[in-house]
Interface confidence: low
């Protein structure tokens, strides 16, 4: 039989309304102020809270924390850190708080933190170290099994003087702590390219969301070991024809399901390996729906729908006839 | 030294009430939930109740629900076991036991209980 | 509820000798990190006493001769070399979900 609660399955210092107690462990301690906590169900929410930094009270049976829509702007080294550690939380989303530094250390002694969210935070400073913790070549591994970093560019003019897609990813590859990832998810941040080494050392990824960025080429970026990558979301970036080398790479990886729609395909002679491949391939969702956008007289002409005659490319002319 | 003292028992006639009380000291009774688990004669335990440590949330076993309430005080450090409506079967040893922070860890610490007998 | 059923229902064994108890759960009380299953012993006259959490945790205080093992449904308290201060009653109990339950008891004499 499910428990019987006399207060609400939410415990709240503000008024809140719950569904019912399900059936599940009682779960003691208090809930910090501005806070909604369910013992039964091990979640605690400070949602749109204006809170200026975490809780230092946060219950120790916390397996779900939500610390969204707040005004957090820096998470120091320990931001988690309890006595006796939070060792359940395993969920932790931070999205739409405005953090703009995320510093080493700052998950650390989280020994269950399987998901965290990051989205949604303009991060001008994301320290190499803050999923690993330490500045040692090779760190302990990091217990996270999905990552949620979609739209964290900071505005152009908060930015430090360095390229942001390096910043990240020297995030993701420090100390090789994040060899047990997942699901990576990177949509919405101007990424106008992919580092070469990223994905060779996340080796077990699932799930990668790389949608409504600004990638251009995918030429130097390898695939070949992901073996078990199962998505790959490519939609709406700048992506203009994929190589022989990414065709074969992406054929080869046995589970793979790509989703390219509104890249603004170019559709000359360089397209014309993409469009075989594409036209025996079964990798790639919704490939009826992909359409030239250049050149001029052939946008949004279907890139299944063409044939090698179509795809031509004007000549080069010499250099003394060029013009700008 | 974490004790747990509990007192209030005694002998009570069918239908009558009994408030039981634990009284706790060694350790911040805040920040800990507390339950009342009880034995009856010759028997093996069976758990009766639940308090947070804030008195957010209550928990009852289905044989003593609508009629027993288990309430706290902070500030007394003391538990409570409201008692209404009693029948024979309730009679029994009534332990108050501490749950930790971590609700993997069992009860930790528990008194040495008090005598409720329900007879006519 | 869930169920634990708890065997057997008494145990004589010689002293310095080993004793095992067994607890079986209706349903799993685990998850992929713990086991909420505890074991107490209860001396005559006295409360229970908490001896292991989380299926194979010794608490504090506890003698090193009482080990737990298992997960899911199936849990055992091992008593490796039987003392005379050791005869009691053992019971086993989960806090996977309300209400907790223990099992039955097993009374540990010296045979």
């Known amino acids: 039989s499910s428990p019987t609660s006399s207060a609400s399955s939410f415990s709240s210092s503000a008024p809140f309304l719950a569904s019912a107690v399900s059936a599940q462990p009682p779960l003691p301690d208090q809930c910090p102020a501005l806070c909604e906590c369910s013992e039964a169900a091990r979640t605690v929410k400070c949602v749109n809270r204006n809170l200026t930094e975490v809780p230092t009270d946060l219950p120790a049976y916390v397996r779900n924390l939500f610390l969204t829509g707040n005004q957090l702007a820096v998470l120091p080294a320990g931001a988690f850190a309890r006595r006796p550690p939070l060792a359940e939380l395993a969920a932790l989303n931070l999205s739409g708080s405005r953090l703009d530094e995320v510093r080493a250390g700052a998950f650390e002694h989280l020994p269950s933190l399987r998901q965290l969210d990051l989205s949604h935070n303009p991060l001008a400073d994301l320290s190499p170290f803050a999923f690993s913790g330490s500045n040692a070549s090779v760190s302990a591994p990091s217990p996270l099994v999905e990552l949620i970093l979609n739209h964290i560019v900071p505005p152009e003019d908060e930015r430090q003087n360095r390229s942001f897609e390096g910043m990240v990813v020297a995030a993701l590859l420090a100390g090789r702590a994040l060899q047990g990832l997942r699901r990576l998810e990177l949509a919405s941040n101007h990424f106008l390219y992919l580092p070469r080494d990223v994905l060779a050392q996340l080796p077990s990824l699932r799930h990668l969301d790389l949608s409504n960025n600004s990638l251009v080429s995918l030429t130097y970026v390898s695939f070949r070991n992901l073996t078990h990558l199962e998505s790959l979301h490519l939609e709406d970036n700048a992506l203009k024809v994929l190589h022989n080398g990414t065709l074969a790479e992406l054929q080869g990886l046995p589970h793979i399901r790509v989703f390219l729609d509104n890249n603004p395909w170019v559709c000359d002679c360089h397209m014309a390996d993409m469009v075989t491949w594409l036209k025996e391939t079964e990798v790639v969702q919704g490939k009826d729906r992909l359409t030239c956008a250049y050149p001029e007289k052939m946008r949004n002409r279907v890139l299944l729908e063409l044939n090698s005659a179509d795809l031509d490319c004007d000549p080069i002319l010499p250099p003394s006839l060029q013009t700008s | 030294e974490v004790q747990l003292v509990e007192s209030g028992g005694g002998v009570v006639q069918p239908g009558r009430s009994l408030r039981l009380s634990c009284a706790a000291s060694?350790?911040?009774?805040?920040?800990?939930?507390m339950h009342w688990v009880r034995q009856a004669p010759g028997k093996g335990l069976e758990w009766v109740a639940y308090i947070s440590s804030g008195s957010s949330t209550f928990y009852y076993a289905d044989s003593v629900k609508g009629r027993f309430t288990i309430s706290r005080d902070n500030s007394k450090n003391t538990l409570y076991l409201q008692m209404n409506s009693l029948r024979a079967e309730d009679t029994a040893v009534y332990y108050c036991?501490?749950?930790?922070?971590?609700?993997?860890?069992?009860?930790?610490?528990w008194g040495q209980g008090t005598t409720v007998t329900v007879s006519s | 509820d869930i169920v634990m059923t708890q065997s057997p229902d008494s145990l004589a064994v010689s002293l310095g000798e080993r004793a095992t108890i067994n607890c079986r759960a209706s349903q799993s009380v685990s998850s992929s990190t713990f086991s909420y299953m505890h074991w107490y012993q209860q001396k005559p006259g006295q409360p229970p006493k908490l001896l292991i959490y989380?299926?194979?945790n010794l608490e504090s205080g506890v003698p090193d001769r009482f080990s737990g093992s298992g997960s899911g449904t199936d849990f055992t308290l091992t008593i490796s070399s039987l003392q005379a201060e050791d005869v009691a009653v053992y019971y086993c109990q989960h806090s996977w979900e309300i209400p907790y339950t223990f099992g039955g008891g097993t009374k540990v004499e010296i045979k």
């Open positions: 060694g350790f911040t009774f805040s920040n800990f939930g």
């Open positions: 036991a501490r749950s930790p922070a971590y609700y993997r860890y069992g009860l930790d610490y």
């Open positions: 989380s299926s194979s």
